[in-house]
């Protein structure tokens, strides 16, 4: 670039030879002259961007080498400059290679392979081993700078390329370059912990692993204790892996070897990159000693019909985990332990459910069912009162010596005995007869057994042949027995 200034204004220096580009053969003398009364210095910018200075206005380079290819700039005291680009043509060194090669995703990357000879053709980029370049890769050659790869993609990472050009019909290649691509950060890191809450006993070891995933190793990550101001936790173990070129994973393992009650609180795993930050928290509760808390059962009194099934369900919280669970029936240990399971999939879960399934219950199987649970520090229990509802059964129906008719029935709940009379012609007995005496006999050892009811009527009130019905009933069902009055007295029962 040569001077052109208006008269009276300071003008830039003049360079001889007066041309913008100069080709010198390697081994020849390079001679440049800067003409300016206020000359300050020559500077030469090498192909790898280093500056060489010369305070003499004549730049003479005997036996010029290819590495002297570049921009020569003359400056004066007014701060004005003029430049010339010199090619030092060397048959043995067509390309000046500036290694290595880095690029950022979505930006351009310059393959530094400027030419020493501008008069070659087909200056281009090729894959090192003659394979095709990626189809979406575009490049722009510039003999003075090199070849620019446009809009670098992640897929180009570690792509091996060479600069190439034809001289006199022969292809010449530069040294190899492999492109190292830095991913553009387009999302926040992915941060996760396996459990969001932890319960420990004093003295236990607390360990929690935070996994951070990002495209680059430059992601920052740390554990913080929120109490309430975030405090950085230094004692953290690091593990990291490259799952692929842009698939980086790091694990930050926080360990408290002997937890104290005041270690309880919220711990945050925090990660950030140039796009933004992400965090996840986990809560630690440290207790002095273990515990078992049985949730209130809605109804510990259970009524079930004879022959049906019932589930006795207990929900409880326990830490440490329960060691012994058992069911006791009427103060005797049951062989049935019940089915115990954790209430959720959360590994640190302390909520449990125990279910005792009682199948086809008999009337004799009512009673107290007690669930006992214990761990190393605590125990707890809950008792269910199970009542088996049974249809009344008439045990005896007799004509006593004193002329009384007596009916004895058992069942649960307590049966009601009603008496009816009907003449022989009637299909159903509907005329009620009032009993003379009703007694409830507590023959059962436990309060859960069937209740026995005895009812009597005076047979002397009957003046006609017919049938007397003793009907025992409760919520479950009814049973009847019949006394027939005829010339020859008989008794028969129908249920």
């Amino acid at each position: 670039s040569q001077p052109s200034a208006s008269p009276g204004e300071p003008s830039p220096p003049s360079i001889h030879p007066a041309q913008s580009e100069l080709i010198v053969e390697a081994g020849d003398t390079l001679s440049l002259t800067c003409i300016d009364p206020d000359f300050v210095r020559w500077t030469f910018k090498t192909y790898f961007n280093e500056m060489v200075e010369n305070k003499k206005n004549e730049w003479i380079q005997e036996k010029a080498e290819a590495t002297r290819t570049g921009t020569y700039t003359c400056s004066n005291s007014n701060g004005l400059t003029s430049s010339i680009y010199v090619f030092v043509r060397d048959p043995a060194k067509l390309f000046l290679v500036g290694l290595p090669l880095f690029g950022k995703e979505d930006s351009d990357a310059l393959v530094r392979c400027p030419l020493t000879d501008p008069q070659v053709s087909n200056y281009s980029l090729i894959e090192c081993d003659g394979k095709s370049l990626p189809t979406d890769l575009t490049f722009v050659p510039n003999p003075k700078a090199g070849i620019t790869i446009k809009n670098v993609k992640r897929a180009y990472h570690r792509l091996c390329v060479r600069c190439a050009a034809q001289r006199d019909g022969t292809w010449l290649h530069s040294d190899k370059f492999t492109l190292k691509v830095r991913a553009a950060i387009k999302a926040i890191p992915v941060v996760s912990v396996p459990e969001t809450s932890h319960l420990l006993k004093k003295g236990d070891t607390f360990t929690v692993v935070c996994t951070i995933k990002d495209v680059s190793t430059s992601v920052n990550s740390m554990w913080l204790k929120m109490n309430p101001q975030p405090q950085h936790i230094a004692q953290v173990k690091h593990n990291s892996w490259h799952r692929g070129d842009f698939n980086y994973e790091r694990q930050e393992t926080l360990t408290i070897s002997s937890a104290r009650v005041d270690d309880s609180g919220v711990f945050m795993c925090y990660a950030n990159n140039t796009f933004g930050s992400a965090n996840v928290t986990t809560t630690l509760k440290v207790v002095e000693k273990g515990f078992i808390n049985i949730s209130p059962v809605k109804n510990t009194t259970v009524f079930v019909t004879d022959g049906e099934n019932v589930d006795l369900v207990v929900e409880y919280e326990a830490y440490p985990k329960p060691e012994h669970q058992q069911w006791i029936y009427m103060n005797r240990t049951s062989a049935n332990k019940g089915k115990d399971y954790v209430k959720s999939d959360n590994k640190s879960n302390i909520r449990y459910v125990n279910q005792l399934r009682l199948t086809r219950l008999k009337g004799t199987e009512g009673g107290t069912y007690t669930f006992l649970v214990s761990n190393s520090d605590a125990s707890a229990s809950v008792t269910f009162n199970v009542y088996v509802n049974t249809k009344p059964e008439i045990l005896t129906y007799d004509r006593l010596i004193n002329g009384m008719l007596q009916c004895v029935a058992e069942g649960f709940p307590e049966p009601t005995i009603d008496w009816y009379f009907c003449t022989g012609a009637e299909q159903r007995c509907t005329t009620p007869v009032s009993p003379v005496d009703v007694q409830v006999q507590n023959v059962s050892v436990s309060p859960f057994g069937k209740l026995v009811v005895q009812s009597s009527i005076d047979s002397s009130v009957f003046r006609h042949n017919g049938t007397v019905e003793c009907k025992a009933s409760n919520d479950v069902g009814k049973s009847s027995a019949f006394f027939n009055f005829a010339f020859k007295e008989q008794i028969q029962a129908h249920t």
Partner: antibody, heavy 118, light 111 residues
Framework: QVQLVESGGGVVQPGRSLRLSCAAS????????MHWVRQAPGKGLEWVAV????????DYTDSVRGRFTISRDNSKNTLYLQMNSLRAEDTAVYYC???????????WGQGTTVTVSS | DIVMTQSPLSLPVTPGEPASISCRSS???????????LDWYLQKPGQSPQLLIY???NRASGVPDRFSGSGSGTDFTLKISRVEAEDVGVYYC????????FGQGTRLEIK
């Protein structure tokens, strides 16, 4: 000539800090990724840290992450390793190395010795 | 991390005889670009390591042609066709595919 020269090593107590330097000359420092590699007495080589040519990307071996920081000043042609919370197992000769186009270490410094001892 | 395992750990050789060192990686070092990211270094007594072979089989500048590297994927070999006294030292393989790891080293000594 082309060379790397480490400095800053010495004897230090556990828990203390030390800063290593690596002065580069004879090549365009700002173009190259740089690494620190260490060698414990009588042991093999262990990679420690890397920094990209422009300082944007950094990575560390897991045992020093959070304690060591790699940095560079391209205007001074110098690579650094700030070592905090030093431990006995950090005792080693620390080398800086230049990464070439093939991601190999084509140039190494002479090493500087760090001894962590109480 | 990728684990690098060298064998033998000690290699006594007579000058003029060939020598061979094996290096095995816990996972393939072959990148999709076709290169194996496996390098060999020699650390002579009292010196810094020096690069011998890069990308599995390419000799570094100034390295004598008696040194050669071969292999792909997980199995690699460094061969010295005729050992000379100046070849004494510890040889390390190193993978650069992921976070850099070295083999434990093979000590070559003259018988």
């Amino acid at each position: 000539q082309v060379q790397l020269v480490e400095s800053g090593g010495g004897v230090v107590q556990p828990g203390r800090s030390l800063r290593l330097s690596c002065a580069a000359s004879g090549f365009t420092f700002s173009r190259y990724g740089m690494h620190w590699v260490r060698q414990a007495p009588g042991k093999g080589l262990e990679w420690v840290a890397v920094i990209w040519y422009d300082g944007t990307n950094k990575d560390y071996t897991d045992s020093v992450r959070g304690r060591f920081t790699i940095s560079r000043d391209n205007s001074k042609n110098t690579l650094y390793l700030q070592m905090n919370s030093l431990r006995a197992e950090d005792t080693a000769v620390y080398y800086c190395a230049r990464e070439d186009w093939a991601e190999a270490f084509d140039m190494w410094g002479q090493g500087t010795t760090v001894t962590v001892s109480s | 991390d990728i684990v690098m395992t060298q064998s033998p750990l000690s290699l006594p050789v007579t000058p003029g005889e060939p020598a061979s060192i094996s290096c095995r990686s816990s996972q393939s070092l072959l990148h999709s670009n076709g290169y194996n990211y496996l390098d060999w270094y020699l650390q002579k007594p009292g010196q810094s390591p020096q690069l011998l072979i890069y990308l599995g089989s390419n000799r570094a500048s100034g390295v004598p042609d008696r040194f050669s590297g071969s292999g792909s994927g997980t199995d690699f070999t460094l061969k010295i066709s005729r050992v000379e006294a100046e070849d004494v030292g510890v040889y390390y393989c190193m993978q650069a595919l992921q976070t850099i790891t070295f083999g434990q080293g093979t000590r070559l000594e003259i018988k």
